[in-house]
């Protein structure tokens, strides 16, 4: 089958600090040296890009400075972390992998990770 399979966890719960991490793993049909990883958020059938990074195999994954994502790569596996999440950001986060170089190009789209974010309760005022 001339396609690339991408695996990611079905559900992840963000920490109380609004940080969610998950692994995106792809089965590469070719020997790619340049890979692009994009995190997409799907809500009400609308898809928006959360963050994206291109990396050379063996090198670190670098997102833009103002990105809410960080990540590390190891072989065909990418460890993604999204920070600054709030309850309203709860949704389906899709991992998209593209083998950019050398040819042929391959596209791989995961089924998505449902990230649940619960805003922490505000600390009650202390009475002294």
């Amino acid at each position: 089958c001339k396609a690339m399979h991408v695996a990611q966890p079905a559900v992840v719960l963000a920490s109380s600090r609004g940080i969610a991490s998950f692994v995106c793993e792809y089965a590469s049909p070719g020997k790619a040296t340049e890979v692009r990883v994009t995190v997409l958020r799907q809500a009400d059938s609308q898809v928006t890009e959360v963050c994206a990074a291109t990396y050379m195999m063996g090198n670190e994954l670098t997102f833009l400075d103002d990105s809410i994502c960080t990540g590390t790569s190891s072989g065909n596996q990418v460890n993604l972390t999204i920070q600054g999440l709030r309850a309203m950001d709860t949704g389906l986060y899709i991992c998209k992998v593209e083998l950019m170089y050398p040819p042929p190009y391959y596209l791989g789209i995961g089924n998505g990770t449902q990230i649940y974010v619960i805003d922490p309760e505000p600390c009650p005022d202390s009475d002294f």
Partner: antibody, heavy 118, light 108 residues
């Protein structure tokens, strides 16, 4: 609104050159791969070329390889197709199309006609 | 290169009837990367279905897609006058990007 508008088509003699442009608006141009697709009169759709994101990676269909060059200027939100050594069988309507977030071609321009004839 | 073959070449139907269009791939295509487009004379193609079965924004629910592996289907449950057009399938999971030759749905 999200829009693609092609220009630059016309009538040209075999062996000559032409440059097509595709002006994008309403979306973050640099975040999307951009394709050229053509359609010869009375026939189906044929993929021509793609350029990705920052413009480093490009792919071409075999019939145009070595003759056509795809490029983009992200600061101007514009896609280009430089067509050299044009042949009769390059006669077609040329469309630019956006590769959507999930890969399919979700936005298309209206097309520009290129006629190669002596 | 993945070759897509569409059938029939032409489908002659009346408004209100059901249209079933077929797209067969020369090798297995993941359903995530199969799209259908509609094209009317003098117009650009329009994305109808992506991922084999997901409707694009603004596409009425009379259009539906199905299939996996090498066999895919586009169904129009009840043809409206504006649905008479040419339909193309496409695979976009790997280069080169390829289209089927098209199926023309015409008024009987």
């Amino acid at each position: 609104q999200v829009q693609l508008v092609e220009s630059g088509g016309g009538v040209v003699q075999p062996g000559r050159s032409l440059r097509l442009s595709c002006a994008a608006s309403g979306f973050t141009f640099s975040s999307y791969g951009m394709h050229w697709v053509r359609q010869a009169p009375g026939t189906g759709l044929e993929w021509v070329a793609v350029i990705w994101y920052e413009g480093r990676n490009k792919y071409y269909a075999d019939p145009v390889k070595g003759r056509f060059t795809i490029s983009r200027d992200n600061s101007k939100n514009t896609l280009y197709l430089q067509m050299n050594s044009l042949r009769d069988d390059d006669t077609a309507v040329y469309y630019c199309a956006r590769a959507g977030d999930l890969g399919a071609f979700d936005i298309w321009g209206q097309g520009t006609m290129v006629t190669v004839s002596s | 290169e993945i070759v897509l073959t569409q059938s029939p070449g032409t489908l002659s139907l009346s408004p209100g009837e059901r249209a079933t269009l077929s797209c067969r791939a020369s090798q297995s295509v993941s359903s995530s990367y199969l799209a259908w487009y509609q094209q009317k004379p003098g117009q650009a193609p329009r994305l109808l279905i992506y991922g084999a079965s997901s409707r694009a924004t603004g596409i009425p629910d009379r259009f539906s897609g199905s299939g996996s592996g090498t066999d895919f289907t586009l169904t129009i449950s009840r043809l409206e006058p504006e649905d008479f057009a040419v339909y193309y399938c496409q695979q976009y999971g790997s280069s080169p990007w390829t289209f089927g030759q098209g199926t023309k749905v015409e008024i009987k």
